[in-house]
């Protein structure tokens, strides 16, 4: 007799999950020698033991702290670049300045970037048809759990100037409900955070409007300041260009407005 | 810098099939997410397919889904892309690039970081 599964409104786990957390381990401790230490096979475990036979909106981020305490990792806290709902240009812009670091150039970034999981209750299968929808579903299933656990964690490690990207082509720039309107933010460490810089980034061609005057980053402004953390922000109207003057700062193109 | 040498191109007749290489020398593909991209004449350069750091997940564009296929050899050291049922849309210069990270989607062609290498030419003609 079939087994009833619950259907959830999110697509299901990613194919070949476990296969592409340990090959992605073992890949990130080849890359990073810092953390050649780690073991692979009990970091797939303590990721595995998080949410199989869990309930899958039921899911906290003390099931995550075995993980955590494995992937413990040590970025340059003054180097740390945030980014919301504009990911790949992120992650463009570390490809070519390559001392900054995204969640996703950690560890437990890197295993999980782009994957989507979960189980079942009281059994040891992983969803492979589907998985929970944090709007249709639940707030508390294994990725959003994860990506909010590991996001205040980096969050708490930075120090110094740190910057944020965030998508200009959206309605709503700053968007509280997002991870880092939601997580990242609030975790941000006063003591240890001077500046919160971001940078808007600017989707159409002719567009010349000054973003940073937009009233969420007005709100994204009176948030930092409130927390003691001075604010600033800049427009990147030309993202194209301001990734080649970034790889090539001396062209002279690069000293006008990008 | 990273750099790419491709090669395989050539001229085919529609309905043709073709294999590009996409090879590194110095250090180590496996590495890296790759994406192979084409430059039509006049045309803006699109991502076409990439294939991730494990080599288990895949992502193609529109315009190639179930003709193309991207893979990696065992050893690491090239990325191919094998392309079946050619069309004279298919013309263009070819290029492979790679990303910092695990997942496809650092490799957005449209606001690419990459130094591209010269590319391999593909022609599509009766």
């Known amino acids: 007799v079939p087994r009833w599964r619950q259907q959830w409104s999110g697509p299901g786990t990613t194919k070949r999950f476990p296969e592409t957390v340990l090959a992605r381990c073992v890949k990130y401790t080849e890359i990073h020698p810092e953390m050649r230490h780690v073991d692979c096979q009990s970091v797939w475990d303590a990721f595995k033991g998080a949410f199989i036979s869990k309930h899958p909106c039921n899911i906290t981020e003390e099931d995550y702290q075995p993980l955590m305490k494995l992937g413990t990792q040590t970025v340059p806290c003054n180097k740390i670049l945030l980014w919301s709902r504009i990911k790949d240009l992120a992650h463009q812009f570390t490809q070519v300045q390559r001392d900054m670091f995204t969640l996703e150039d950690t560890l437990l970034g890197y295993l999980a970037d782009d994957l989507t999981w979960c189980g079942e209750f009281n059994t040891s299968k992983i969803n492979y048809q589907s998985c929970p929808d944090w709007r249709k579903d639940c707030s508390n299933n294994p990725v959003s759990v994860f990506w909010k656990t590991v996001s205040r964690r980096f969050a708490e490690a930075a120090c110094d100037v740190v910057h944020v990207m965030l998508n200009g082509s959206r309605s709503k720039i700053f968007d509280k409900n997002s991870t880092f309107g939601s997580v990242e933010v609030h975790n941000l460490q006063p003591e240890k955070v001077q500046t919160l810089e971001a940078w808007v980034i600017h989707g159409g061609r002719e567009d010349s409007r000054d973003l940073c005057q937009d009233p969420t980053i007005k709100e994204l402004e009176s948030i930092i300041s409130k927390r003691n953390i001075q604010f600033s922000c800049k427009n990147i109207y030309r993202p194209d260009k301001f990734l080649q003057c970034v790889k090539n700062p001396e062209d002279s193109s690069c000293t006008s407005e990008i | 810098q990273v750099q790419l040498v491709e090669s395989g191109g050539g001229l085919v007749q529609p309905g043709g099939s073709l294999r590009l290489s996409c090879t590194a020398s110095?250090?180590?593909?496996?590495?890296?997410?790759i994406g192979w991209f084409r430059q039509a004449p006049g045309k803006e350069r699109e991502a076409i397919a990439c294939?991730?750091?494990?080599?288990?997940?895949?992502n193609y564009g529109d315009s190639v889904s179930g003709r193309f296929t991207i893979s990696r050899d065992n050893a690491g050291t090239t990325v191919y892309l094998q392309m079946n049922s050619l069309e004279a849309e298919d013309t263009g210069i070819y290029y492979c690039?790679?990303?910092?990270?695990?997942?496809?989607?650092?490799?957005?062609?449209?606001?690419?970081?990459?130094?591209w290498g010269q590319g391999t030419q593909v022609t599509v003609s009766s």
């Open positions: 690039a790679p990303a910092r990270y695990a997942a496809c989607s650092a490799l957005d062609v449209k606001l690419s970081f990459t130094s």
């Open positions: 110095g250090f180590r593909l496996d590495y890296y997410a």
């Open positions: 294939i991730d750091i494990t080599g288990f997940h895949t």
